[in-house]
Interface confidence: low
């Protein structure tokens, strides 16, 4: 018995120990999100196993204080959703000490009224404005600088309709260095990490973008004031072209975003002359005026492999030969305006004959194949070199209709160390949630308990392998305090354990003959530190009351050996 | 702004080849096909063919295909096409322009005069 | 290969007078046509795509139409630049084809 597999919050992540009872789940959020809930649930035992608390969500929050901002973004409230009316949201993002900041417009989509986006100069809603949406027809692409060390970011919508707000990215970046680039859809490569004069950066997309403006190539320039020689450039969802790749997607123009209505596109696909192409529309949310066209050849003339309209699901089609012609035509009259409305085509160069396609390599990694025919169960496993993970699934099979089973996975740079654990009697502050190169741990001992080994440890990036941490998590031994001096026993009392010195932590117990009442605490304990000491003072018996003095006296008399006896021990 | 230069007139003999410029700019060079055109005095257009210069892929029309050879440079953002064997009937204007919906930019045409 | 048939092959009309070329195509090319000027000096420039789109910068006097496979360029008011030559092209089908041209002269 287990419990269920936690839902993962949108814009967030959860990574599970176990679903067993015991097993936990720790939930956090994309950048730019917070978490609202627990950040940690725990499956309990029962009949039928359940987790401690509800699952978390992450929201975007209309304003906050970043402060020690490095790398990270802020969005409006239900980005990429719409956000809502009457909202004042302020951000203020500080940069560590002696760092600017670099901003970056991913989005701006704000409704045509009177919603406005103001960016300024500075730490408070009177430092000067260097954006303002109603001043500014085109975002600036190459972005925002600080000349200090803040930027203060104001959103206001009024009453009337709403739009998917924004999203900004910001950096932070030294005194004589470049702002860490940004290419949305795509991905860059640096000559070093931390960008200064002298740095190059090489940019990509990511499959079925294009690049576009700005340059493939850019580098840090000018010593006295660092700055890109060209602007970033951009990758988008182009409508039509043509392609010649052995595998690639197709993409709806301007995907994510929503296409454009009258729209005319026509994309032709390309592989060797006796090969063949498998189309896999992975998405398929198009209006129901608008037309997706596959053609079996290399024109609008060739024959028709399928014709779609309206939203499908996930299906896979089979030309016949080396080309086919994809064409999309969206309604010139309406438009279908949602976030993720559109098409996502992936193809693949298959062979005609009686075998799977031929799997490439992958950078960082290596494959083996079970058999070196591709044919039908043919199994290949891709493995990843040391310090690069398999991403996506490592093993792929030869299916019945000659696709894989799989996509091809990749292999990533390991750019985090593990978890380095709780470490008993201790308690940890932690400067990054998932130990990104650079984060640290630090353990901090509970009182009475000494920290044997390095208090903090640093993730350390490596040339070969993975990142590992400075060193080994510490202990927390037990500390080698001096002993509490044993108290007398109160009169007309009697204490234990009768020892003349007490160990730190150790505990004594009182207790009182007949007819006296114990007057203070009845257990004390001896406290670690230095010197150790009682927590409280010795407690007195106090006779309860005349008569009961008296009638405790005659009982006293009574059983005489038995009681002197006792009240011998006590003194 | 979109600009394609060609290169300039060329005067050649029968048998000989001839190798034609077209140098864009204003755009990202293999972010579109190059089409080429040819224009004999006095008549229409005709359609060469097309090459994609991000994958050097070409296309060309059956009529063409051992003529024309299509070629790019990405580095100096230049389409280039070279016609071989020469005969009288391929002294022409020859155009470039720029797709993917062909034609939106032209250049402005290469004269290729082609005389003993 | 799609034959794309132009008339008239030449046409004289003066200023301010309304014309329309045509172009009809032997197989179906659904609205793939581009009209292009050619102007005496041998400069091309495109006027309308996908058979009516106008591109940016083309006065808003000339328009594109089409009628099943017959496909019309109209100039409601001629000015004195748009004397020159006109083809339409087909893009639906490889290898393109251009229709034989219009000769637009000044009467």
């Known amino acids: 018995l287990s419990c269920h597999f936690p839902r993962r919050p949108a814009y967030g992540d959860v990574t599970v120990t176990s679903l067993h009872p015991g097993g936990s789940a720790r939930f956090h959020c994309a950048t730019g999100y917070q978490l609202k809930g627990a950040r940690h649930l725990t499956c309990l035992n029962a009949t039928q196993p359940f987790w401690d608390s509800k699952e978390p969500v992450c929201i975007a929050a209309c304003g906050g204080v970043i402060r020690n901002a490095t790398t990270g973004r802020i969005v409006s409230p239900g980005f990429p959703g719409n956000y809502s009316n009457n909202l004042t949201c302020h951000w203020l993002l500080e940069a560590p000490e002696g760092q600017r900041l670099h901003l970056h417009f991913e989005k701006v989509s704000l409704a045509e009224d009177d919603d406005r986006l103001i960016i300024r100069n500075g730490d408070n809603v009177e430092a000067p404005p260097v954006y303002d949406s109603y001043e500014v027809e085109y975002l600036p692409i190459e972005g925002l600088l600080s000349s200090g060390k803040h930027f203060f970011v104001e959103l206001s919508t009024d009453s009337s309709g709403a739009a998917a707000g924004m999203a900004l990215r910001y950096e932070a970046f030294q005194q004589g260095h470049c702002y860490e680039p940004f290419v949305k859809y795509g991905n860059f490569s640096s000559s070093t990490p931390t960008y200064p004069v002298g740095t190059t950066v090489e940019f990509s997309c990511d499959p079925g973008y294009t690049l576009e403006q700005g340059s493939i190539i850019i580098e840090c320039v000018d010593p006295h004031d660092p700055q890109w020689n060209e602007t970033e450039p951009a990758c988008r969802a182009v409508c039509s072209g043509e392609i010649t790749d052995s595998a690639g997607v197709v993409l709806s123009p301007n995907w994510p975003e929503p296409y454009g209505r009258g729209q005319d596109c026509i994309w032709g696909v390309h592989v060797e002359e006796d090969k063949r192409i498998m189309l896999d529309i992975r998405v398929l949310r198009i209006g129901p005026g608008d037309v997706l066209t596959f053609y079996d050849g290399d024109d609008l003339t060739a024959r028709v492999l399928g014709q779609y309209s309206g939203p499908r699901s996930h299906f896979k089609l089979f030309t016949s030969m080396a080309d086919v012609t994809i064409q999309f035509q969206s309604d010139p009259g309406t438009s279908v305006l949602g976030y993720q409305q559109g098409f996502v085509i992936h193809f693949f160069e298959v062979p005609r004959n009686d075998t799977c396609p031929e799997l490439p390599e992958i950078p960082n990694g290596w494959k083996s194949p079970s058999q070196p025919e591709l044919v039908h169960g043919t199994v290949v496993t891709y493995q990843c070199y040391p310090g690069y993970q398999v991403v996506g699934s490592s093993v792929l099979m030869c299916q019945w209709d000659l696709t894989w089973s799989e996509d091809l996975p990749s292999c990533q740079r390991v750019t985090s160390c593990h978890d380095p654990g709780d470490v008993e009697h201790s308690r940890r502050l932690i400067s990054s949630p998932k130990f990104p190169v650079g984060a640290t741990v630090q353990y901090i001992c509970d009182q009475g308990f000494v920290l044997m080994g390095s208090s903090i440890l640093t993730c350390h990036d490596r040339q070969a392998g993975s990142p590992k941490w400075s060193d080994r998590a510490p202990k927390c031994l037990l500390e080698q305090l001096k002993p509490c001096h044993g108290l007398s026993a109160p009169e007309n009392g009697a204490r234990s354990p009768e020892k003349q010195l007490h160990p730190a932590g150790a505990t004594i117990h009182f207790s009182c003959a007949p007819g006296y009442v114990l007057k203070g605490q009845a257990s004390i304990k001896c406290v670690p530190g230095h010197p150790s000491h009682w927590s409280d003072p010795p407690p007195i018996c106090r006779a309860a009351s005349l008569d009961g003095f008296y009638n405790s006296r005659s009982l006293d008399v009574a059983k005489a050996p038995a009681a002197s006896s006792t009240l011998d021990a006590a003194h | 702004q979109v600009q394609l230069q060609q290169s300039g007139a060329e005067l050649a003999r029968p048998g000989a080849s001839v190798k034609m410029s077209c140098k864009a700019s204003?755009?990202?060079?293999?972010?579109?096909?190059m089409h080429w055109v040819k224009q004999r005095p006095g008549q229409g257009l005709e359609w060469i063919g097309y090459?994609?210069?991000?994958?050097?892929?070409?296309k060309y029309n059956q009529k063409f295909k051992g003529k024309a050879t299509m070629t790019a440079d990405k580095s100096s953002s230049t389409a280039y096409m070279q016609l071989s064997s020469l005969t009288s009937e391929d002294s022409a204007v020859y155009y470039c322009?720029?797709?993917?919906?062909?034609?939106?930019?032209w250049g402005q045409g290469t004269l290729v005069t082609v005389s003993a | 290969d799609i034959q794309m048939t132009q008339s008239p092959s030449s046409l004289s009309a003066s200023l301010g007078e309304r014309v329309s070329l045509t172009c009809r195509a032997s197989?179906?090319?659904?609205?793939?046509l581009i009209w292009l000027q050619q102007k005496p000096d041998g400069t091309i420039k495109r006027l309308i795509y996908?058979?009516?789109t106008l591109d940016s910068g083309v006065p808003k006097r000339v328009s594109g139409s089409r009628s099943g496979s017959d496909y019309s360029l109209t100039i409601s008011s001629l000015e004195s630049e748009d004397f020159a030559d006109y083809y339409c092209?087909?893009?639906?089908?490889?290898?393109?084809?251009f229709g034989g041209g219009t000769k637009l002269e000044l009467k």
């Open positions: 092209l087909q893009y639906a089908s490889y290898p393109l084809t």
């Open positions: 322009g720029r797709g993917l919906v062909p034609f939106a930019y």
């Open positions: 197989q179906e090319i659904s609205g793939y």
């Open positions: 090459i994609n210069p991000s994958s050097d892929y070409t």
């Open positions: 204003g755009y990202t060079f293999t972010s579109y096909t």
């Open positions: 996908a058979a009516s």
